[in-house]
Interface confidence: low
């Protein structure tokens, strides 16, 4: 009967922000500036991540955790830990895999992002089209035809355009 | 770290004001994203009244508090406002500040621990 | 304004429970929908983002799904400090809305 021995690895002392230094008889040194840990036992700090270009830092790196990027204003974020970052759209388009598509007909989007979304049926609620529907505006529907007395104007100016996310005041 | 800290709340008489302020540090207000006020009224859910954009050009409101609530930032001191006048019963709340992290859309990814307004007689 | 229907509004559940909470929006918000925990007397805490991105730091056991209308937060094995309240928030439009929330009881 063989006993088998547990062997205690020394590396797995160090905590997190440190690193197993070989050159230093196995001793936890801090990592590095710019360098990171994010767990214990490690023999190297990884690198931090930097956030230029289109590229923005969400959160800064520490000696326990990698940088954060996030994409400047006019660009989203696409990928796992947004490791890409893609243009946004324009009103009157949406995106798609391939890219930012133009509304199909009978759709709009007022946004610089989400869905292109039908024209709202003014004949469902018995009314008429006052102002007809674009690629980035919603129809305006009025009174219904026999409604209409000669000479008499209701059209109602279409709804301000929206940035991504919001409805300015 | 980020990290927002609200201040100013208190008890105040209805048709009153209060001034919140959050106070950032870790982050500059000034980097972008939008910075927020949300509320919870006592064992309820939460409800968002207003944001304003990095450069501090465009502000939104919720309807229940537009015209009465005015939000604002100073960038020398990093700290965002929250100007509350009119106030009624039902704007008693805890009121949080956050930031909106911007991937693909807007979440609010920090806050603030929250500062308690009584709207009471 | 787009509203945002949780079910269920509360529910008891045991350690090591798969729990599933959903999330309807009354409009199409694409993938625009975040959500948060809450415990008493903490500000929320952010989970998951654009629908199925875990936050940093946020254990995997936590996942979300769905687009459109209709959304999933999914809690594999819950954990005794899982124990909170959540909710769903869309950021398609303004103004921004929250689900009325959804508290997670021990049974």
């Known amino acids: 009967f063989e006993r088998t021995r547990s062997l205690q690895d020394p590396c797995s002392n160090c905590p997190a922000g440190t690193f197993c230094d070989n050159n230093r008889n196995q001793i936890c040194s801090p990592c590095p500036p710019n360098s990171f840990s994010s767990a214990g036992g490690q023999r190297t700090c990884d690198i931090c991540r930097q956030c230029k270009g289109v590229f923005r830092t969400r959160k800064e790196c520490s000696s326990t955790s990698n940088a954060e990027c996030d994409c400047t204003p006019g660009f989203h974020c696409l990928g796992a830990g947004c490791s890409m970052c893609e243009q946004d759209c324009k009103q009157g388009q949406e995106l798609t895999k391939k890219g930012c598509k133009d509304c199909c007909f009978g759709t709009f989007n007022d946004q610089k992002r989400g869905i292109c979304r039908p024209w709202t049926n003014c004949s469902l609620d018995g009314k008429s089209v006052l102002v007809n529907g674009t690629k980035e505006r919603d129809v305006v529907c009025g009174p219904s035809p026999a409604d209409l007395s000669p000479g008499a104007s209701s059209v109602t100016p279409p709804a301000p355009a929206r940035e991504p996310g919001h409805s300015p005041q | 770290e980020v990290q927002l800290v609200e201040s100013g709340g208190g008890l105040v008489q209805p048709g009153g004001s209060l001034r919140l302020s959050c106070a950032a540090s870790g982050y500059s207000i000034s980097s972008g994203y939008y910075w927020d006020w949300i509320r919870q009224a006592p064992g309820k859910g939460l409800e968002w009244v207003s944001s304003?954009?990095?450069?501090?050009?465009?502000?939104y409101y919720a309807d229940s508090v537009k015209g009465r609530f005015t939000i604002s930032r100073d960038n020398s001191k990093n700290t965002l406002y929250l100007q509350l006048n009119s106030l009624r019963a039902e704007d008693t709340a805890v009121y949080y500040c956050a930031r909106e992290y911007y991937g693909y859309g807007y979440a609010l990814d920090y806050w603030g621990q929250g500062t308690l307004v009584t709207v009471s007689s | 304004d787009i509203q945002l229907t949780q079910s269920p509004s509360s529910l008891s559940a045991s350690v090591g429970d798969r729990v599933t909470i959903t999330c309807r929006a009354s409009q199409g918000i694409s993938s625009y929908l975040a959500w948060y925990q809450q415990k008493p007397g903490k500000a929320p805490k952010l989970l998951i983002y654009d629908a199925s991105s875990l936050e940093s730091g946020v254990p995997s056991r936590f996942s979300g799904s769905g687009s459109g209308t209709d959304f999933t937060l999914t809690i594999s094995s819950l954990q005794p400090e899982d124990f909170a309240t959540y909710y769903c928030q869309q950021y398609y439009s303004t103004p921004l809305t929250f689900g009325q929330g959804t508290k997670v009881e021990i049974k």
């Open positions: 304003i954009s990095g450069d501090g050009d465009t502000t």
